[in-house]
């Protein structure tokens, strides 16, 4: 199709080489087409809809994204050629940063229902650059935490080194929806609830004498509880003896509950104690079996191919530790009578 009639938007993604970050493009169809195509079931052409780039009209979620090769080749369907780019409704998610994401991206409705819809498309020229200026050492992270029940703020990474006074007007989106009241480089949250978690996008316009473009950053916000003040507790094994059959295989499971910690380094190990000998057992990796906002249950198993007489003399010790402290639980094997 002819893309010369598409509206054009220029975007800049300046990514930090120190952290993982994502990026998004909205199928931000121009207002007149949006009112005609995207909201045709609900609005007359005279009514201008609220500016929601990735809103819930059934039509709007059914868009097609293309990339325009720089060598003039035909448009490429994003879904077929770019595994690190995911389409979710009207949004294009870039999972990894890199200058190779630079280029022209075009979106338009899949279903062309009338001659007016032919020009219902938008071309986004995306420029991707690594962050070079070391002047802003403490720029906001692309992953930010809000403590539930307290006040907090979400900072726009690309503007976090500027004071509120000198900051340009910012457009914020949360999970693709425009936050129309927010215009500053920081969103202040009076009281944090779990619904404040999500993907936030901040945009501002930058201009030079020739052109203007949108500088965009994406922030993943999670709501968290305060760090635990407790050492982990072992949920299993509960008993300190275990009845077994000699010659049979045996798996002993150690399950431990770890309270939430922002910097989470749980340790769960098995040891064998045999008189004055103690050593760490090589066992399969630990796995998380349940995770909630407040805590996580982690399990690690010790596997004996077959129980021997020698194993009856030993103690099998599960050891768990977090930044607060550690707990152990030992199990002695006893032959079934």
């Amino acid at each position: 199709f002819n893309i010369s009639g598409c509206s054009t938007k220029k975007l800049l993604w300046t990514y930090s080489t120190r952290s993982e970050e994502e990026f998004v493009l909205f199928c931000d169809l121009p207002e007149p087409q949006k009112s005609h195509f995207c909201h045709r079931n609900r609005l007359s052409p005279k009514q201008v809809p609220e500016h929601l780039p990735f809103m819930g009209s059934n039509d709007l979620s059914d868009v097609q994204w293309y990339q325009q090769p720089s060598n003039g080749d035909p448009l490429e369907d994003i879904r077929k050629s770019y595994p690190h780019i995911i389409q979710d409704k009207c949004t294009l998610h870039f999972l990894t940063p890199g200058v190779n994401n630079s280029g022209s991206y075009i979106c338009r409705p899949k279903m062309i229902k009338s001659p007016y819809d032919v020009a219902c498309c938008v071309k986004m020229i995306l420029e991707v650059k690594p962050q070079t200026n070391a002047s802003c050492e403490y720029s906001a992270s692309h992953k930010q935490d809000l403590l539930l029940g307290s006040t907090g703020s979400i900072s726009c990474p690309s503007l976090s080194c500027q004071s509120d006074a000198q900051s340009p007007a910012v457009t914020w989106y949360k999970n693709g929806k425009l936050l129309s009241v927010e215009r500053s480089n920081r969103i202040v949250v009076d009281e944090v609830y779990d619904y404040h978690q999500g993907t936030y996008v901040c945009d501002y316009t930058q201009s030079d004498t020739v052109s203007s473009w949108t500088v965009r950053a994406v922030v993943q916000v999670r709501t968290i509880v305060g760090d635990t003040k407790l050492k982990p507790d072992i949920l299993d094994p509960v008993e300190d003896t275990l009845e077994v059959e000699l010659g049979k295989p045996l798996t002993i499971s150690c399950k431990a509950r770890f309270g939430f910690e922002r910097v989470f380094n749980p340790v769960i190990k098995w040891y064998i104690k045999d008189s004055d000998l103690e050593w760490e057992v090589s066992v399969p990796e630990a796995k998380s079996i349940k995770s909630t906002l407040k805590d996580e249950i982690i399990e690690r198993n010790i596997i004996l191919e077959k129980v021997t007489q020698r194993d009856l003399r030993r103690k099998f010790v599960c050891f768990v530790q977090n930044s607060i402290g550690n707990t152990t639980q030992s199990v002695q094997l006893k032959e079934k009578r």
């Epitope: 008189s275 004055d276 000998l277 103690e278 050593w279 760490e280 050891f319 550690n326």
Partner: nanobody
Amino acid sequence: EVQLVESGGGLIQPGGSLRLSCAASGSISSRDTMGWYRQAPGKGREMVSVISSSGNTNYADSVLGRFTISRDNAKNTVYLQMNALRAEDTAVYKCYAHRTYGVDYWGQGTLVTVSS
């Protein structure tokens, strides 16, 4: 800071012998359990043999009768005499010291390759 430095690895023919040494420095105690673990390419780490300060030992079934562990408490050194080596003994051998639950130290490892 505890440091464990292994030596004695190398290329050896099947049926041959090697002796590994591990010198411990820093706050290592003669009360600590010491020993050897190994990790073959693409496999998990496995305990080969451990020894207590009093000389009590434990061996993996696969090396029983072929390998002998010993230690010199005065020198804070542990040895592993490996005889009748097989191709399946090829691995990086790491020295191990255990102070108490959760306090374990590992060496960088020495490569043992058994091949004709």
